[in-house]
């Protein structure tokens, strides 16, 4: 769905895409884990939150994230199908008033405290990938995805077809 030619063509246009309305389509809580079943966890350290990718001990409770789904116009000047081109974006909030943010300068994923309306850095285009895995593409930097690097979440540039389906940008959502 996000082939290289597609990614390059949308780099400029995606910045201009507008989110339809301010209220989400739907919201629900889910735990987030990697393709290899490591859990994404959040810990409060020195008044800021850290994000970890780790194996949980047996019976250890998984952290939940509030996923809020928004519908956005897919840039129609490129897609050629007018107003009908749409995409889903999500924001991810593990705790009240904190949202995952893309820090494109540092290629990092951070938790920031902020008020609504949320900045563009908090929005990720949702892709359904292998079976029931999803990927999260930065709204502010198309072709860049949330991924796993050295047991942390990081931003990973997907710049060749072979890298598109690498396991480190695939995540599982579980509501149980």
């Amino acid at each position: 769905a996000f082939g290289i030619s597609g990614v390059q063509k949308y780099t400029r246009a995606l910045h201009d895409s507008s989110i339809t309305g301010i209220s989400p389509i739907t919201e629900y809580l889910a735990s987030l884990s990697t393709y290899n079943d490591q859990s994404i966890t959040f810990a409060l350290e020195d008044e800021s939150y850290e994000i970890y990718v780790e194996d949980l001990k047996k019976d250890e409770k998984k952290d939940k994230v509030l996923l809020s789904y928004y519908e956005s116009q897919h840039p129609s000047n490129e897609s050629g199908d007018g107003v009908d081109g749409k995409m889903l974006m999500v924001t991810l909030s593990p705790t009240k008033d904190f949202w995952l943010h893309a820090n494109n300068k540092e290629h990092s994923v951070e938790l920031h405290k902020c008020e609504k309306p949320l900045p563009d850095q908090a929005f990720f285009v949702l892709h359904n990938m292998h079976s029931n895995c999803v990927s999260f593409e930065c709204k502010t930097d198309p072709g860049v995805f949330i991924g796993v690097k050295d047991n942390h979440l990081a931003l990973i540039k997907v710049d060749s077809s072979e890298n598109l389906c690498t396991e480190n940008i695939l995540f599982k959502l579980s509501e149980t």
């Epitope: 082939g3 629900y28 897919h74 897609s79 749409k86 889903l88």
Partner: antibody, heavy 122, light 107 residues
Framework: QVQLQQSGNDLVKPGASVKLSCKAS????????INWIKQRPGQGLEWIGR????????SYNELFKDKATLTVDTSSSTAYIQLGSLSSEDSAVYFC???????????????WGQGTLVTVSA | DIQMNQSPSSLSASLGDTITITCHAS??????LSWYQQKPGNIPKLLIY???TLHTGVPSRFNGSGSGTGFTLTISSLQPEDIATYYC?????????FGAGTKLEVK
């Protein structure tokens, strides 16, 4: 406007294989997944699988994993499905369909090809 | 796999009637449900996505509602061109699955 043009109907012998095509126009082919759906005469709809033309990435319904092979040719904006070891159970109309949302199957299928009827008969 | 239980399997109504088709998902699919209309010999046509949003060009007499596991398609003031088979489809998880269909006929 978005269009999906499928190849013509096919009559094939049991045990043979067949390759159907779906040519897309009116949008950026590499940006939306193409799905394949089967409909037996007088029956309902069954999802076979989907392919991302930009990457060639594929997701199959387990029921069709040994039956169908999905491919694309981005230079001609065409998706293909190859059906192998055909039997009477495979006699059906096969549709290609483009997803509503960029990157996501949550919104269903907004655009459909006209369908290709495959008849398996000796 | 998520099973989609659609009812009734067939329905006979008079022109001008309001009819209701229901779809029940075997697990929570939130709002990720689509409805299609298929006329004999034709292709399926997307009517409603996201449980309640009308696709472009679909008349307002079609109405979708529900979330979670229970969904409804309502057609008010039935028209001759509405005679078709209607399918629900869940888009929550792979494999994507359809209801068995509801064949709508005129009395």
């Amino acid at each position: 406007q978005v269009q999906l043009q499928q190849s013509g109907n096919d009559l094939v012998k049991p045990g043979a294989s067949v390759k159907l095509s779906c040519k897309a126009s009116g949008y950026t082919f590499t940006s939306y997944w193409i799905n394949w759906i089967k409909q037996r005469p007088g029956q309902g709809l069954e999802w076979i699988g989907r392919i991302a033309p930009g990457s060639g990435f594929i997701s199959y319904n387990e029921l069709f994993k040994d039956k169908a092979t999905l491919t694309v040719d981005t230079s001609s904006s065409t998706a293909y499905i190859q059906l192998g070891s055909l039997s009477s159970e495979d006699s059906a109309v096969y549709f290609c369909a483009r997803e509503f949302y960029y990157g996501s199957f949550y919104g269903g299928f907004a655009y459909w090809g006209q369908g290709t009827l495959v008849t398996v008969s000796a | 796999d998520i099973q989609m239980n659609q009812s009734p399997s067939s329905l006979s109504a008079s022109l001008g009637d309001t009819i209701t088709i229901t779809c029940h998902a075997s697990q929570n699919i939130h709002v990720w449900l689509s409805w299609y209309q298929q006329k004999p010999g034709n292709i399926p046509k997307l009517l409603i996505y996201k449980a309640s949003t009308l696709h472009t060009g679909v008349p307002s007499r079609f109405n979708g509602s529900g979330s979670g596991t229970g969904f409804t398609l309502t057609i008010s003031s039935l028209q001759p061109e509405d005679i078709a088979t209607y399918y629900c489809q869940q888009g929550q998880s792979s494999p994507l699955t359809f209801g068995a269909g509801t064949k709508l006929e005129v009395k």
